[in-house]
């Protein structure tokens, strides 16, 4: 039975040319996190592994940076960077779990930031 | 830190037996599958068989099917081989390995690869 | 069974030379295929999974390339302790199978 619940910074903004931290803590489990894949849409930006370390797809790796933790730095942000990621819990033995975060990215310099999440 | 250690080789008669274990620690050990891998002396490396988490799916080798049991006790975190009707080929480094699983989401399946292995432990087969 | 072919055999190059190895598969592994390092008397060391994702800690002048039935494993500038065997491996299907090894060895 999955018990999990995945906690996440939720709906973000930022601002055009600047960075963020994607966050996401699963939590209420004794289950094993063997890998954490981010997903932009359908496309993969990056995966945590627990044995064999961090991947950034091709693509994305001038502008993703791992950490902090299981999280993502994004840098170098533009208007197209807007919108849904997730964060997918691949434990063992629950199965997956999955977290939804939202992006604006704007032009404004008084983007509003999401409050900063913290891993406990 | 991940440790696998071998123990049980030594020199052994053909049709003999013998049995290996594999004592770990530093992980918890029910959440992984493990393998035995062995290498001849001067040659290249074979798998020989893998056991799931829970014990549940064995796989072999051809060459060893029906001579070898690959066993493990969570409670102990040991994994063994039993290897009974031994031949000169059997002669080999066995090594305990423990999977590293990768999710492929492109395939929707997981991967089993090799991050961490013991030291060995030999076994020779001879009259 | 899947048959792994390396070549060459043996690789005779002096360090900061490039190294380049191959394997091929008897039919088609996808991406599942990783690349080891074994020092003698030494553990096998896994180098590549995925067929080009580099393991934890291992230095980026080792990469990885190719998909389906042929793979190659580069060495970008020869270290002193890059001289060793390499082996690939499928982990496609059970059971799973190594390539005969290549030796890096310095000329």
């Known amino acids: 039975m999955m018990t999990g619940t995945i906690e996440t910074t939720g709906n973000i903004s930022a601002e055009k040319g600047g960075s963020i931290i994607l966050q996401c803590h699963l939590s209420s489990t004794t289950a094993q996190v063997t890998q954490v894949n981010w997903e932009q849409q359908d496309q993969l930006l990056a995966i945590c592994n627990a044995d064999l370390g961090w991947h950034i797809s091709p693509s994305f790796k001038d502008r993703v940076a791992p950490g902090p933790g299981l999280g993502l730095t994004l840098q170098s942000l533009t208007v197209n960077d807007t919108g849904e990621y997730f964060c997918i819990y691949h434990t063992y033995p629950d199965g997956t779990y999955t977290g939804r975060i939202f992006l604006e990215v704007l032009e404004s310099s008084v983007a509003e930031h999401g409050a900063r999440f913290q891993i406990p | 830190e991940v440790q696998l250690v071998e123990s049980g080789g030594g020199l052994v008669q053909p049709g003999g037996s013998l049995r290996l274990s594999c004592a770990a620690s530093g992980f918890t050990f029910s959440s992984y599958g493990m393998s035995w891998v062995r290498q001849a002396p001067g040659k290249g490396l074979e798998w020989v068989a893998n056991i799931k988490q829970d014990g549940s799916e064995k796989y072999y080798v051809d060459s060893v099917k029906g001579r070898f049991t690959i066993s493990r006790d969570n409670a102990k975190n040991s994994l063994y081989l039993q290897m009974n009707s031994l031949r000169a080929e059997d002669t080999a480094v066995y090594y305990c390995?423990?999977?590293?699983?990768?999710?492929?989401?492109?395939?929707?399946?997981?991967?089993?690869?090799?991050?961490?292995w013991g030291q060995g432990t030999l076994v020779t087969v001879s009259s | 069974e899947i048959v792994l072919t390396q070549s060459p055999a043996t690789l005779s190059l002096s360090p900061g030379e490039r190294a380049t190895l191959s394997c091929r598969a008897s039919?088609?592994?996808?991406?599942?295929l990783a690349w080891y390092q074994q020092k003698p008397g030494q553990a096998p060391r896994l180098l590549i999974y995925?067929?080009?994702k580099r393991a934890t800690g291992i230095p980026a002048r080792f990469s990885g390339s190719g998909s389906g039935t042929d793979f190659t494993l580069t060495i970008s500038s020869l270290e002193p302790e890059d001289f060793a065997v390499y082996y690939c491996q499928q982990v496609h299907n059970f059971p799973l199978t190594f390539g005969g090894g290549t030796k890096v060895e310095i000329k």
């Open positions: 390995a423990r999977v590293s699983y990768y999710y492929d989401s492109s395939k929707l399946r997981w991967a089993e690869y090799f991050q961490h």
């Open positions: 995925d067929a080009s």
């Open positions: 039919q088609s592994v996808s991406s599942y």
